[in-house]
């Protein structure tokens, strides 16, 4: 039976005498009138058992005291403590060839636990040793024993275990207590690696090299090692472990987010509070759930707020020009909370008689700058139908508004579209060149929109440019342009009006005149 | 759910003291608990905690004063030398899983250490 | 570690008035906001009465309010009652770490 003793965290017992309840029954040789166990009381009145001899008056000594089998629990080194007094041979009258003041240590590997005899030249000698302090007869009679420490080291051992050897020489010794022990690197936790029980080296200066492994719920960032140094302290660690997502470190273990929070990635990083408008119900959360209502776009990361598709736009103002619109509006009061906001146009064309009875505008209609995606808070409708219904929708969209789209994300207008001008006329002609006239022609406008009442010819000499200019309006589809300048260069433009009013001028067509009559057909372009 | 501290009495001091914390109505493997402390007539005191996995956690001032322990259903703390400043009403409580806090706490068992 | 200060560490109100305690951290709490209030009244075991800063426990009147963050953070108790008469104690988290404030004691008059 064996009571607990206190040692260092880093020391492992092998054998202690003190701890040891009843007779320790070593073996001694001789038998008898050597080492002859004694018990003690130490200085908390507990009984010990120890070993004494005192033969200092006989000459030629050779006392052996044999501890039980030791087994070496895979050390390779062990150390041995002796706590003993021993008796200062000049306080002892008559005894000056005969008494000494140290013994010896020995030891012996064996894999038998059940050797019962000593057999001397079997042991190996570990040292001489002899005590610091020594006492005297006065010491004796004040109760002061002076209790000596000494240590020694043995290995590499290699057999399943040894047997210890006292051997005495002449000297008044007291055994009070003998400790066998090894030394180990105790289970440790650093970085977040785990590493085991170490046994140290065989050598004094070894260093055993040891993987740690992850504590639950991390991974290693990058192979965590120590170092079990000899004294059985940890050195040098090196690499890492991290905690997984949804854990955090604390107090050396990684421990799950707790509701509310989260972590997204294996880092160092505590975890974060759920950001704005998302929770976690439970422990452990890599992400956090979005409110009802609210999303997080695919590309938006889990540190995010979750946002909402934005309000609709306001204050929407239409402003008609004939076939054309222009629609201006405010950025919504709620944009979700999200800064990409863009807008999208939605064109309906609608019946007179039913606004119901909406289909989509097509592709003949135009939008400046673009339909879809907007930037900016207005756009330009062209190439409308006159006369026509329209409704205009505008869509305010942000990175979630996929989601969860909603009527409450769009403003609408309709509008009806005034009769239109005519559309510009794409081909003049210069029939016949004078020197003093020309004589044009040209095709009606693809685009009329309504009954062309006459045509306007707009001409001006080149060099001019355009300062100074006449104009000649006729219902008919030619004109002789008469009173011109013989060798010069005229430019000539024609529109359509109907009672919507003027369409565009045509593209320029430039003539020279000439100094003898000829009949030359222009297209538009430069005619001589 | 409950908890309830046993085990408090008169010590001597230096004479080792544990006190038992016992839980109802939860498991201990889904909860850490603390043991949290208050002197006659003074504030509370947070001395450790006793983490899920069965790791332990002290206050500084609390180091090798203290030594928290669990089974199944108790938590123990074991005052390892007592001193007369030791004495105090100790409460054991439950750490919350939505907050960094006690959501359970037991009614206090009274440690008086005098010689 | 993080140091609790409780101010003021006692206070008198009148029935129906109101009561401000604060609370402040030597550095910021975990996740600026892991601060709890508990009130204990003589002979009993402390009770939460409000988590996460300014969320109020599970029926706790709300006439119990918390607010603040980082490391100032403030326990206003308005129309008091008698049973209101108790020490209010603030608990920070950080760094593995628990600490109470030292506690304030209310009266009510």
């Known amino acids: 039976v064996t009571g607990s003793r206190v040692y260092p965290a880093n020391e492992v017992t092998l054998l202690d005498s003190r701890s040891v309840q009843g007779e320790l029954g070593w073996i001694a040789s001789p038998l008898e009138g050597g080492w002859e166990e004694v018990s003690i009381m130490d200085e908390k009145n507990t009984p010990i058992r120890t070993y004494q001899v005192c033969n200092v008056m006989e000459p030629s000594q050779n006392n052996w005291l044999r501890t039980d089998w030791i087994t070496r629990e895979g050390a390779q080194r062990v150390y041995i403590e002796i706590k003993f007094t021993l008796r200062d041979c000049n306080s002892l009258p008559g005894v000056m060839g005969t008494c000494k003041e140290t013994f010896n240590l020995y030891y012996y590997e064996s894999d038998n636990d059940k050797e019962r005899f000593i057999r001397e030249n079997q042991f190996v000698k570990i040292d001489t040793i002899a005590a610091d302090e020594s006492f005297t007869q006065v010491d004796i009679g004040d109760r002061i024993m002076k209790l000596n420490t000494e240590i020694r080291d043995v290995g590499p051992l290699s057999k399943k275990g040894f047997y210890l050897a006292f051997q005495d020489v002449g000297a008044c010794i007291a055994l009070v207590s003998v400790r066998v022990f090894y030394k180990k690197c105790p289970l440790t936790v650093r970085n977040l690696a785990q590493f085991p029980d170490t046994i140290t080296g065989a050598d004094t200066s070894s260093l055993v090299e040891v993987r740690g492994s992850c504590v639950n719920n991390s991974e290693e960032k990058d192979v965590p090692k120590m170092y079990c140094g000899a004294d059985g302290e940890w050195l040098v660690p090196i690499g890492n472990c991290l905690c997984n997502a949804g854990h955090e470190e604390r107090s050396g273990e990684c421990q799950a987010c707790k509701i509310g929070y989260y972590k997204a990635l294996s880092t160092d990083a505590t975890c974060a509070k759920c950001p704005p408008h998302s929770y976690s119900v439970w422990e452990g959360a890599t992400s956090c759930t979005c409110d009802r209502g609210f999303f997080r776009a695919d590309n938006d990361a889990a540190s995010m707020p979750c946002t909402r598709p934005p309000s609709a736009p306001l204050n929407l103002i239409s402003n008609v020009n004939e076939t054309s619109v222009n629609l201006e509006w405010s950025s919504p009061q709620n944009t979700g909370g999200r800064q990409d906001i863009s807008y999208n146009v939605v064109c309906k064309k609608c019946g007179a008689g039913d606004p119901s009875k909406c289909r989509p505008c097509g592709s003949g209609v135009h939008y400046t700058p673009q339909q879809n995606g907007l930037k900016t808070t207005k756009v330009s409708i062209t190439d409308l139908l006159a006369h026509t219904n329209y409704t205009f929708e505008i869509w305010a969209v942000n990175g979630v508004s996929k989601y969860n789209p909603s009527p409450d994300q769009s403003v609408s207008v309709t509008v009806t579209t005034n009769q239109a001008a005519p559309s510009s006329i794409a081909l003049v002609q210069a029939k016949e060149v004078t020197r003093y006239s020309v004589a044009l022609a040209w095709l009606e406008p693809d685009r009329p929109n309504g009954v062309i009442l006459e045509y306007e010819v707009k001409y001006y000499e080149k060099d001019q440019n355009e300062r100074s200019y006449r104009i000649v309006r006729t219902a008919a589809r030619n004109t002789d342009i008469k009173g011109l300048n013989p060798l010069t260069s005229y430019v000539f433009h024609v529109r359509a009006r109907t009672a919507a009013g003027y369409g565009d001028f045509s593209e320029p067509l430039e003539v020279t005149t000439n100094t003898v009559p000829s009949r030359i057909i222009g297209d538009g372009a430069n005619s001589t | 759910q409950s908890v309830e501290e046993s085990g408090g009495r008169l010590v001597t001091p230096g004479t080792p003291l544990t006190l038992t914390c016992t839980v109802s109505g939860f498991s201990l493997s889904s909860y850490h608990m603390s043991w949290v402390r208050q002197a006659p007539g003074k504030g509370l005191e947070w001395i450790g905690i006793?983490?899920?996995?069965?790791n332990t956690y002290s206050a500084n001032w609390a180091k090798g004063r203290f030594t928290i322990s669990k089974t199944s259903t108790t938590v123990d703390l074991k005052i390892t030398s007592p001193t007369t400043e030791d004495t105090a009403t100790y409460f054991c409580?439950?750490?919350?899983?939505?907050?960094?806090?006690?959501?359970?706490w037991g009614p206090g068992t009274l440690v008086t250490v005098s010689s | 570690y993080v140091m609790m200060t409780q101010t003021p560490s006692s206070v008198s109100a009148a029935v129906g008035g109101t009561v401000t305690i604060n609370c402040q951290a030597s550095?910021?709490?975990?996740?600026?906001?892991?601060l709890a209030w508990y009130q204990q009244k003589p002979g009993q075991r402390p009770k939460l009465l409000i988590y996460r800063a300014s969320t109020l426990a599970s029926g706790v009147p709300s006439r119990f309010k918390g607010s603040g963050s980082g490391t100032e953070f403030t326990l206003t108790i308005s129309d008091l009652e008698c049973a209101d008469a108790a020490t209010y104690y603030c608990l920070g988290y950080k760094s593995d770490d628990y600490t109470f404030g030292g506690g304030t004691k209310v009266e009510i008059k």
């Open positions: 409580a439950r750490e919350s899983s939505t907050f960094y806090g006690m959501d359970l």
């Open positions: 550095q910021s709490v975990y996740g600026n906001n892991e």
């Open positions: 006793i983490y899920r996995s069965g």
